[in-house]
């Protein structure tokens, strides 16, 4: 895969993942009422990071925001923070990566600057994805803990009720937002890794293109060093050549056809 394609694909994958993180953060269905092994109610409860909702069989849906900060569980606050950090990092990552895209020429920005920006955006996407995955996982863990606690309460609490009046405890299970969040976080992470990989190919290496002349024993010997790359540490010449090689098309030729790789 060419550097431009790898970078472009990484950008698109990250962009999709980032959109998913925003969607998951905004979704109301982080936890949904567990319907299995429960009395069948005509009311369906579900909760998000910002509000809780109730949908009646009548079709009427009512959502109430969590208007308090102090009264909310610390874990929920932590999940909110992680998701917001993930979004903020994602926004920065997108802005940086737009300028870093090889298919977009901005002023006299050289490949070295683009490589650094690509690496930066890749790292930002990776952290953004990790934040989302951790946030969703923390919430899922909280749900599992509460689920088993309420299950235990359901079975232990019935004895002391005299057998007549019973209170049904609403148990919550994984909502759609958790799955969206996990997938979105994973995509953002993968996109970030791809950007980092693309960065390697963008790093300029003079020894690839410039022949160096040595004067030895009165002879003019021109050669290209092969496996010697102390300055970059990116392996052998053949590997770098393979990354840069776009068939018959040169790097400049790719630049003259920006629409093919224009993801902005």
């Amino acid at each position: 895969m060419s550097v431009t394609a790898c970078q472009g694909l990484g950008f698109v994958v990250s962009l999709i993942g980032f959109a998913g993180i925003i969607a998951a953060t905004c979704m109301d269905q982080w936890s949904t009422q567990d319907l299995y092994n429960n009395p069948v109610t005509a009311v369906f409860n579900y909760q998000g990071l910002w509000r809780s909702c109730v949908r009646e069989s009548s079709g009427f849906t009512e959502c109430r925001g969590y208007f308090t900060l102090l009264g909310l569980p610390a874990m929920l606050q932590a999940v909110r923070a992680l998701m917001i950090v993930g979004i903020v990092l994602g926004v920065i990552g997108i802005l940086v990566s737009i300028f870093a895209l090889k298919c977009i020429r901005i002023g006299s920005m050289d490949d070295s600057a683009k490589a650094k920006m690509t690496l930066t955006s890749g790292i930002l996407f990776i952290i953004s994805g990790i934040c989302a995955i951790i946030g969703v996982s923390v919430f899922a863990n909280m749900l599992v803990t509460n689920f088993w606690m309420s299950t235990a309460n359901m079975y232990s609490g019935m004895g002391g009720m005299g057998g007549m009046v019973q209170t049904v405890q609403t148990r919550y299970t994984f909502g759609a937002a958790l799955f969206v969040g996990w997938v979105a976080g994973g995509l953002t992470l993968i996109g970030g890794v791809m950007m980092c990989i693309a960065c390697r190919g963008l790093t300029p290496d003079d020894s690839n293109f410039k022949a160096v002349s040595y004067h030895a024993s009165g002879q003019n010997v021109a050669y290209r060093p092969g496996g010697f790359k102390a300055s970059t540490g990116f392996g052998s010449n053949t590997r770098n050549k393979k990354i840069y090689d776009g068939g018959a098309r040169t790097e400049d030729d790719e630049q003259s056809h920006p629409t093919k790789y224009d993801y902005v």
Epitope: A42, V54, S57, F60
Partner: antibody
């Protein structure tokens, strides 16, 4: 305004079936559940089941499962309730009702008297 | 199924007096998701279908006179008619709107003393 108009009274033999219709008007038929409730003479109200006319989804009272079938025809905005294997104790007024806030029944049909007699 | 028990079975109240009907459910009808009680009250006059008076235990249906009020939470509910009028003579039913199958109380017959 919302209106539910039911079919006329029926006299049936034990073991037979009856199909009561409920024509809705004045609202988007497919957007609201239609419920069926019956009332035996001098007795209380008994919920039989419901249908979501938009999706065709139904929910029946276990007491009537296997004997009651609720259907809906969106093209005519009409809901139907069919009760089979009729017994004398099925003699009742059958009402259709449209669901409202709180899963309640704010709009009712005028009722259809079904008499099961040999 | 949820059992709805109304008391009393019949009630005779003088015109202008307060009438109180109680309803008890075998399970809590409180939904913690929105803190609403899924209980309704209906009025039925002879030869007519029931008429919705109260939903969510205490919310009066539009067009219902404000002398009708509902209260209670969880398993115990009350319908109160603050000042009985002649047209209030009817049978009153409470209904569980939370659990399937929806169930009704046996009814309370309200008469004028």
């Amino acid at each position: 305004q919302v209106q539910l108009v039911q079919s006329g009274a029926e006299v049936k033999k034990p073991g037979s079936s009856v199909k009561v219709s409920c024509k809705a008007s004045g609202y988007a038929f497919s957007n609201y559940l239609i419920e069926w409730v019956r009332q035996a003479p001098g007795q209380g109200l008994e919920w039989m089941g419901l249908i979501n006319p938009g999706s065709g989804g139904t929910n029946y009272n276990e007491k009537f499962k296997g004997r009651v079938t609720i259907t809906a025809d969106e093209s005519t905005s009409t809901a139907y309730m069919e009760l089979s294997s009729l017994r004398s104790e099925d003699t009742a007024v059958y009402y259709c009702a449209r669901v409202y806030y709180g899963n309640t029944f704010a709009y009712w049909g005028q009722g259809t008297l079904v008499t099961v007699s040999s | 199924d949820i059992v709805m028990t109304q008391s009393p079975d019949s009630l005779a109240v003088s015109l202008g007096e307060r009438a109180t009907i109680n309803c008890k459910s075998s399970q809590s009808l409180l939904n913690t998701g929105n803190n609403k009680n899924y209980l309704a009250w209906y009025q039925q006059k002879p030869g007519q279908p029931p008429k919705l008076l109260i939903y969510w235990a205490s919310t009066r249906e539009s067009g219902v006179p404000d002398r009708f009020s509902g209260s209670g939470s969880g398993t115990d509910f009350t319908l109160t008619i603050s000042s009985l009028q002649a047209e209030d003579v009817a049978v009153y039913y409470c209904q569980n709107d939370y659990f399937y199958p929806f169930t009704f109380g046996q009814g309370t017959k309200l008469e004028i003393k």
